[in-house]
Interface confidence: medium
């Protein structure tokens, strides 16, 4: 069954239940509900999921039974609207329930919260986790799905099933190991880090679809798939792009059952047609479904076909350029993007999209000119500065990273971004700058040919985090401008921002710089975050402070924490030495 050929089903819920099986059906409904109602207790969600599942089973037995012909949005929306505390817990979101489909679902989607007010997930002791896992494996795994889904309301649902499978495997193996902690903790750390990255990548896909439309997402997909499958024909890439767009549109729209079903179909299609797609798919296609889909999504680029002809012949020198463009603009531009991307695995996707946009703009202008060919003859020369800009930026920043190391590189970015957009909340600036700083460890180790796709496409993901967090509570016109004007130019837009001269420095508040003995028991990462939070606050108080001044204050701060954490009476040390540090810092910065 192809992704698009669906037989008419009397009951959509029965159809999906049969396609996905009970276990996946229940897991996906739980994810969907937790992503919509992020504050509801676990037990309430489990109850709702069980009710939906029982109903689905009646429809499998008899598709003509009452309500079985209703759409999934109607069934799920009706179920969510039975939650008694909807008004108290969610406020105006309860108004969604007064609407009819499809407006009701759109309303629920608009109320998804990228930064929900939920407590940080604290990892219990290993023995406690293993006991819980053995006592009730099913509940333990459901709890994992629930906790991730409610904190990441756009997490790619079929991929979350894959994470849950790995989570289960980690506990199954490690809870029997001699040293449970040594076995389990690294696996959980890896899942946590991969999960955060996966969530952020999917958030960019959803933002691309929702804020910039299907055309923007399709352009991204053409470029990425052409790099990954350079031996595939253009028509084949177009087919994959169309199907992939449908899958992500569904997941981003909350249609998780359809999304998971269609993703499985797409993986099946790719594996059945791997000869005409890529030579790198063989291993992926031997794996079970969830692993297979994940593997295909991460598969390395195939080798480029030998002796690809020059692009200029068809896209610059041909007398038919304007004719081909006029007849079907998007197909011709799609072919251009495909041809360019398959030849350039060394470029970031966003760079390829900038080049395609420049080509489109040139044709729009030149095909209306008196001598079109003369007008667009030098279009490829316009690409040179666009290519050099990210190359130079990556070179400079990788040199800085190698010189400073990750922590100090993050601090340099913290200062840089706080000066650009000081109105943004301190937690957001810390989170985003820390993630921006991770580009160094992630990408600078790669050879030149892999650096740009690694770095710039990763930065697009991180800057999208800034954009979605800022959208919730907009405070900076500059952030809004960079986030909304052009998806592919977000990174250059932020890079081009200088110090915000209009910013009125924040009033000095000694409380912000008061620390206690609890800092001594924090992990290295949490201690870094405390110090980086203080650094952002310093810059907000004194945006014109020099690098040297800030370094001096931060060095003093590090020495202060180290000294007091070694003291016998830590709390007294923090109180007394802290006052001295604040006074010295004020003097050093001229506050």
């Amino acid at each position: 069954r192809g992704v698009f050929r669906r037989d008419a089903h009397k009951s959509e819920v029965a159809h999906r239940f049969k396609d996905l099986g009970e276990e996946n059906f229940k897991a996906l409904v739980l994810i969907a509900f937790a992503q919509y109602l992020q504050q509801c207790p676990f037990e309430d969600h489990v109850k709702l999921v069980n009710e939906v599942t029982e109903f689905a089973k009646t429809c499998v037995a008899d598709e003509s039974a009452e309500n079985c012909d209703k759409s999934l949005h109607t069934l799920f929306g009706d179920k969510l609207c039975t939650v008694a505390t909807l008004r108290e817990t969610y406020g105006e979101m309860a108004d969604c329930c007064a609407k009819q489909e499809p407006e009701r679902n759109e309303c629920f989607l608009q109320h998804k919260d990228d930064n929900p007010n939920l407590p940080r997930l604290v990892r219990p002791e290993v023995d406690v986790m293993c006991t819980a896992f053995h006592d009730n494996e099913e509940t333990f795994l459901k709890k994992y799905l629930y906790e991730i889904a409610r904190r990441h309301p756009y997490f790619y649902a079929p991929e979350l099933l894959f994470f849950a499978k790995r989570y289960k495997a980690a506990f199954t193996e490690c809870c029997q190991a001699a040293d449970k902690a040594a076995c389990l903790l690294p696996k959980l750390d890896e899942l946590r880090d991969e999960g955060k990255a996966s969530s952020a990548k999917q958030r960019l896909k959803c933002a691309s679809l929702q804020k910039f439309g299907e055309r923007a997402f399709k352009a991204w997909a053409v470029a990425r798939l052409s790099q990954r499958f350079p031996k595939a024909e253009f028509a084949e890439v177009s087919k994959l792009v169309t199907d992939l767009t449908k899958v992500h549109t569904e997941c981003c729209h909350g249609d998780l059952l359809e999304c998971a079903d269609d993703r499985a179909d797409l993986a099946k299609y790719i594996c059945e047609n791997q000869d005409s797609i890529s030579s790198k798919l063989k291993e992926c296609c031997e794996k079970p479904l969830l692993e297979k889909s994940h593997c295909i999504a991460e598969v390395e680029n195939d080798e480029m076909p030998a002796d690809l002809p020059s692009l200029a012949a068809d896209f610059v020198e041909s007398k038919d350029v304007c004719k081909n463009y006029a007849e079907a603009k998007d197909v011709f531009l799609g072919m251009f993007l495909y041809e360019y991307a398959r030849r350039h695995p060394d470029y970031s996707v966003v760079l390829l999209l900038r080049l395609a946009k420049t080509y489109e703009t040139t044709l729009e202008k030149c095909c209306a000119a008196a001598d079109p060919h003369e007008c667009y003859a030098k279009v490829f020369d316009e690409f040179k500065p666009l290519v050099e800009e990210p190359q130079n930026l990556i070179k400079q920043n990788c040199e800085l990273f190698e010189q400073l190391g990750e922590y100090k590189f993050q601090n340099a970015l913290l200062v840089r971004y706080t000066k650009k957009v000081p109105q943004v909340s301190t937690p957001t600036l810390v989170e985003v700058s820390r993630n921006l700083g991770k580009v160094g460890s992630k990408c600078c180790k790669h050879p030149e040919a892999k650096r740009m796709p690694c770095a710039e496409d990763y930065l697009s993901v991180v800057l999208n985090q800034l954009c979605v967090l800022h959208e919730k509570t907009p405070v900076s016109d500059r952030v809004t401008k960079c986030c909304t004007e052009s998806l592919v130019n977000r990174r250059p837009c932020f890079s081009a921002l200088e110090v915000d001269e209009t910013y009125v420095p924040k009033e000095f508040n000694a409380e912000t710089f008061t620390f206690h003995a609890d800092i001594c028991t924090l992990s290295e990462k949490e201690r870094q975050i405390k110090k980086q939070t203080a650094l952002v606050e310093l810059v907000k108080h004194k945006p014109k402070a020099t690098k040297e001044q800030l370094k001096a204050v931060m060095d003093d701060f590090a020495a202060f924490v180290e000294k007091c954490c070694k003291a016998d009476d830590k709390e007294t040390c923090f109180a007394e030495e802290g006052k001295k540090l604040v006074a010295a810092s004020q003097a050093a910065l001229g506050l």
Partner: nanobody
Amino acid sequence: EVQLLESGGGLVQPGGSLRLSCAASGFTFDTSSMLWVRQAPGKGLEWVSVIHQSGTPTYYADSVKGRFTISRDNSKNTLYLQMNSLRAEDTALYYCAKFPSSRMKFDYWGQGTLVTVKS
């Protein structure tokens, strides 16, 4: 040897309909994307529509969008073009072709079928 044989052309009044067929042989039809191309009298070639080997997706030139529908039957090795709301400017020789592997060059052509739209 690759063969593509078009049929179904003819004379039709503006607003009328026609269905073109293209029988393919000599290559693996079900793994090939196909397209319809046309050439109006005294004009250059214009591509009309493309269909992927599996039947989706399909693409149309802006000039025919909403009026023409491309389809295929892989079990019969046949490509179709359903043309509705025909206009005088649709008058042309219609060819079916195997979609190019990458560049804008068409690998194999039929001999064409003539569509004439006039009152």
